[in-house]
Interface confidence: low
């Protein structure tokens, strides 16, 4: 077995947005560090068979299976997949190793299975077996994190019951509003499950795994902030834990905080207090209200009071199942060609939604922003002034929501014409929808002013695939106009556009654009 070549099998995972993934299967571009698949000799097999470690791939992922052969001389090869042979072009790398690659773009169920690579070198023949399967993400879950108090310590534990086990991180911010965006320098991230520093302005816990990232914010009432004009509202589902933090800063320690639910003090064991001195020697107190598993009767106004600050309240609403509240009536918009415009949907939802905007079968990422009144808003501005139907789709664990928008772009008509032996037709997609006139050009009317009214059939506006409107007008040919030039004109409030057609005997028809 001494003349057996040294073989290395590797898997290269390409990032989804990676434009460097080659179209050909011979020279893919490496975009990630290769993963060694082992390639061990398979015992008790007829012939020399190497077996690579099984490869699990996400749906739509792009990968390269690659074999590096350290053998003298030239090699030839053949890939076989599901009894079909696939082209194979080996090349040599800088270390003079033979390199054979198979690129799988956007993995689907049909591309899963056994890939056999037959290699013939000057010394010997051998087979390499790759088994590629689609990762069963049906078993995967990513649950929103929740908080628990750490036993006998003033600290919170962040828990996300997810598969595969997620990476948990705390996202902390000590400034107000916009500057607490994820990328802001004011934001500090701690990749740990337990948090002791609970005095910050904004505290979130995030969990991430292969399915994405989910975050939960520690709901906070800050008695030093002017209250919002609408009461902050917190939704929870029956059985979920409730955590509300009340925070207050005062010049000295001579103040206390209390929690009340509908004017009754919270039961002992449902709150705990912490306090610290800040850098300028003022006292910060925080008082947590918590319920380990909420029931319907935990609904109500939770009021945090201080002997030195005005009290503030939050409305906690316990629901049986999640919801998405928004108006789903479709909306039509009419804008100018260069007018700035965004679609927007205002909604209230719990748990937080996942959403997409879709136009012309293409999906666009969807961003949501929380408003002060408990609502959220998602805007879509990237329409590039393309008229048609836009769809907003949102869902959470318990609810789905779809809303349709139609965008019309005001513009002067553009006319296209076509003709057959028996009729001439003109089409236009201007907006507002154009009206049509047909005119005959003759010696009597060289400027084509003689209007044709007979045999004209205007088709009611016809919606194109993605909601764009098109109008057409057809002129049935009569003896009176055969051999003449006719002009069809489409006009709307923004202008007129015409096309001139020569109605000669059957054959090619010249069109003269006439604006």
């Amino acid at each position: 077995n001494q003349d057996l070549p040294v073989i290395k099998c590797v898997l290269i995972n390409h990032k989804n947005n990676d434009s460097s993934v080659g179209k050909s299967s011979s020279y893919p571009m490496v975009s990630e560090s290769p993963e060694d698949l082992g390639c061990a000799l398979r015992p008790q097999s007829s012939g020399t068979v190497y077996e690579a470690a099984a490869v699990e791939v996400d749906v739509s992922a792009s990968i390269t299976l690659q074999v590096l052969v350290d053998a003298p001389g030239n090699i030839s090869c053949l890939w076989v997949f599901k009894h079909s042979s696939l082209n194979c072009q080996p090349h040599f790398d800088l270390q003079n190793r033979g390199v054979v690659s198979m690129v799988i773009l956007k993995m689907t169920e049909t591309q899963a299975g056994e890939y056999l690579l037959f290699i013939q070198s000057e010394a010997t023949n051998y087979t390499i077996l790759f088994t590629v399967s689609i990762r069963n993400t049906l078993l995967y879950t990513l649950r929103r994190p929740y908080f628990r108090k750490m036993e006998n310590q003033d600290a919170l534990v962040c828990i996300s019951e997810s598969v595969p086990e997620p990476i948990v991180e705390w996202v902390l911010c000590d400034s107000q509003g916009e500057s607490c965006k994820e990328e802001s320098p004011a934001v500090v991230k701690k990749e740990e499950k337990v948090l002791h520093e609970l005095f910050g302005t904004d505290i979130r816990c995030c969990a991430r795994n292969e399915l994405g990232r989910e975050c939960t914010r520690l709901f906070t009432i800050d008695l030093n902030q002017t209250p919002q004009t609408t009461l902050p509202q917190l939704f929870l589902k029956v059985g979920e834990p409730l955590w509300i933090r009340c925070k207050a800063v005062h010049v000295n320690h001579g103040f206390g905080l209390t929690w009340e639910l509908e004017n009754k003090a919270l039961e002992e064991g449902n709150y705990f207090e912490m306090s610290t001195y800040s850098t300028n020697r003022t006292m910060i107190r925080i008082l947590f209200a918590f319920v380990s598993s909420v029931a319907r009767n935990d609904t109500g106004y939770y009021t945090c009071s201080s002997s030195k600050h005005p009290s503030q309240s939050a409305l906690v609403t316990i629901v049986e199942k999640g919801f998405i509240n928004a108006t789903n009536s479709s909306e039509d918009y009419e804008i100018d060609q260069y007018e700035e415009f965004c679609f927007s949907v205002r909604f209230k939802a719990y748990p937080q939604i996942r959403c997409t905007w879709t136009f012309s079968r293409k999906s666009f990422p969807c961003e949501q922003k929380g408003l002060d009144n408990g609502y959220s808003i998602s805007k879509f501005c990237n329409h590039k002034h393309q008229p048609g139907e836009y769809i907003f789709h949102a869902e959470n664990d318990d609810a789905q929501f779809t809303k349709m928008f139609t965008l019309n772009i005001r513009r002067k008509p553009q006319v296209l014409a076509e003709a057959s032996a028996s009729q001439a037709s003109c089409f236009s997609d201007g907006y507002p929808l154009p009206s049509w006139t047909w005119k005959k050009c003759s010696d009597k009317s060289p400027n084509c002013t003689e209007e044709i009214t007979e045999g004209v059939w205007n088709r009611k506006a016809n919606r194109k695939v993605f909601g764009q409107w098109v109008s057409s007008s057809t002129l049935n040919m009569s003896e009176a106009i055969k051999g003449f030039l006719v002009k069809c004109c489409a006009y709307n409030s923004l202008g007129t556009s015409c096309e001139t057609i020569l109605l000669n005997s059957p054959g090619p028809f010249p069109f003269i654009q006439d604006n």
Partner: nanobody, 111 residues
Framework: QVQLQESGGGLVQPGGSLTLSCAAS????????IDWYRQAPGKQREWVAQ???????HYEPSLKGRFTISRDNAKNTAYLQMNSLKPEDTAVYYC?????WGQGTQVTVSS
């Protein structure tokens, strides 16, 4: 649904006094805290005083001594007694229960 209606505002000379009333409809009045706020032209709304359901009172420190908050649960009304008024007390005064706000009453202190 709670509805709040402030009254008692008006024009008063510096050093004068006014008593504002906040009448509430709805059964939650006696169970809840009442806050008075004010908003001067071009400024943010600021907290003035608070009375708890048990009758405990809290004041913006700079106003303590001049302003007194009280309540009459039988009449579903809260009051703000303002003495030794100054031009800088000129504002629209609002009362609040939970997230319910009144429409406001204008107080103008001017000679």
């Amino acid at each position: 649904q709670v509805q709040l209606q402030e009254s008692g505002g008006g024009l008063v000379q510096p050093g004068g006094s006014l008593t504002l009333s906040c009448a509430a409809s709805g059964s939650t009045f006696s169970r809840n805290y009442i806050d008075w706020y004010r908003q001067a032209p071009g400024k943010q709304r600021e907290w003035v005083a608070q009375i708890t359901s048990g009758g405990n009172t809290h004041y913006e420190p700079s106003l303590k001594g001049r302003f007194t908050i009280s309540r009459d649960n039988a009449k579903n009304t809260a009051y703000l007694q303002m003495n030794s008024l100054k031009p800088e007390d000129t504002a629209v005064y609002y009362c609040r229960i939970l997230d319910y706000w009144g429409q406001g009453t204008q107080v103008t202190v001017s000679s």
